[in-house]
Amino acid sequence: AGVFELQIHSFGPGPGPGAPRSPCSARLPCRLFFRVCLKPGLSEEAAESPCALGAALSARGPVYTEQPGAPAPDLPLPDGLLQVPFRDAWPGTFSFIIETWREELGDQIGGPAWSLLARVAGRRRLAAGGPWARDIQRAGAWELRFSYRARCEPPAVGTACTRLCRPRSAPSRCGPGLRPCAPLEDECEAPLVCRAGCSPEHGFCEQPGECRCLEGWTGPLCTVPVSTSSCLSPRGPSSATTGCLVPGPGPCDGNPCANGGSCSETPRSFECTCPRGFYGLRCEVSGVTCADGPCFNGGLCVGGADPDSAYICHCPPGFQGSNCEKRVDRCSLQPCRNGGLCLDLGHALRCRCRAGFAGPRCEHDLDDCAGRACANGGTCVEGGGAHRCSCALGFGGRDCRERADPCAARPCAHGGRCYAHFSGLVCACAPGYMGARCEFPVHPDGASALPAAPPGLRPGDPQRYL
């Protein structure tokens, strides 16, 4: 058991151009607070996946009002550390998310409004008991400077807080086979009498006779890897003969979730859905009150004035979970049109539009012809994110800039001769044919196949095509 501690040193504009606007104003004074979320291992999970190692909220910082015309300075911070207690072994590698939240203190109906200013995330290796580690993370134009460490709670010691120490029974030295507890030289390492056969690499115990597993291992002796191979059986230890998995104990066998939590298997391990008032990887953390700020993402905490009375988190729209720690998948309603990609940013939905579409929901089919002139009297035709020109007679090409040879396609039938003309083409028909393209035969008796020849034209005259 132990505590992860986070100390925020500063939050303000990062170096370089494009300083952010102050988040507060004279009309809307505000104050900051921070949330930290920890997950074991070097996971790259989404921000809203469970904070399996734990989470904490800071106190609210001092009220800040922007000075008109002044650049955004480093903003006033809450006092104290953010502390995330962990009951199990410290995993050594962890992922963190640190969120900077703004609480607006204007005249909003229904109390203050919360909004996420910045979120930074990272993956680190850290041994418990080591010195403070310093870090700088940037989120857009903001910069966050902080330090962190993991420390064991007595009687636990060691880089994973799995060794136990007890006060010396004799003043001079420890018992046979027991080392002094660095850095507590006046204490001795307690003999860990775990369940017989408990894996020394993957198991540990805090009470005599138990065998508790590190993440990724399961079974009564912590010898069964949680991950599975590509065989048909969903879980279990490898079979030496086939290399495949044979049925064995699953991660939810025996229900590792404490305090009435329900267990569900995940591809890599298990997840506990905790009853209200409990959280942590195994629902083991309790005694939480509203003063501890257990509701994330702007959730409103009611009740829970003392550790014996349960609190309730009233989640803002879009969040769920007993601590408002999970985001509802609003993108499943597919609000983006025309094949746009939906992104749920928490404070808003965003659509990434396909080429040729724009607007908050990709609802606008871009006017492909805007600013696209078709030359020489051509007209622009739009569609499908592209444009094309319908050219006037005698012109061609993408923008109707090329002069077309109207005779190139040999439009005059029955041996008629084609002449290019400023307004198109003219066919001089061979004897016995007439029409704009010489398409009509003239009958031997002088009558044509047409009802009547146009006035002023004799069969055989050149026909101009308009």
Epitope: P317, G318, L333, Q334, P335, R337, N338
Partner: nanobody, 120 residues
């Protein structure tokens, strides 16, 4: 401000039917997408059925063939006709809408929820 008001929830026996209604009101210029989510105790909130931004109809696999979503554009209302109800359909059903406001901004809104209980 936009309000989504659900109605029609209640208790029904397995195999029975219910019809939920959700009416949107307020400073709405247009409704882009609208549908129904549900949340069973201890479970994540999940989409049940909806009209997408493109106007298509989508359903969760578990309700296909049993639930039908419809709408009345003139009344800014969507309906969920639920038939052949099962015990696992027990949940709080929430109306959700992605709305374009008079300001031309888009906002996503939730209703307060209506409880559907299926038990013998």
């Amino acid at each position: 401000e936009v309000q989504l008001v659900e109605s029609g929830g209640g208790e029904v026996q397995p195999g029975g039917s219910l019809r939920l209604s959700c009416a949107a009101s307020g400073s709405i210029l247009s409704i882009n997408a609208m549908g129904w989510y549900r949340q069973a105790p201890g479970k994540q909130r999940e989409l049940v059925a909806g009209f997408t931004g493109d106007g298509n109809t989508i359903y969760a696999e578990s309700v296909k063939g049993r639930f039908t979503i419809s709408r009345d554009n003139a009344k800014n209302t969507v309906y969920l006709q639920m038939s052949s109800l099962r015990a696992e359909d027990t949940a709080v059903y929430y109306c959700a809408a992605d709305v374009q406001l008079f300001s031309r901004d888009y906002e996503f809104y939730w209703g307060q929820g209506t409880l559907v209980t299926v038990k013998p």
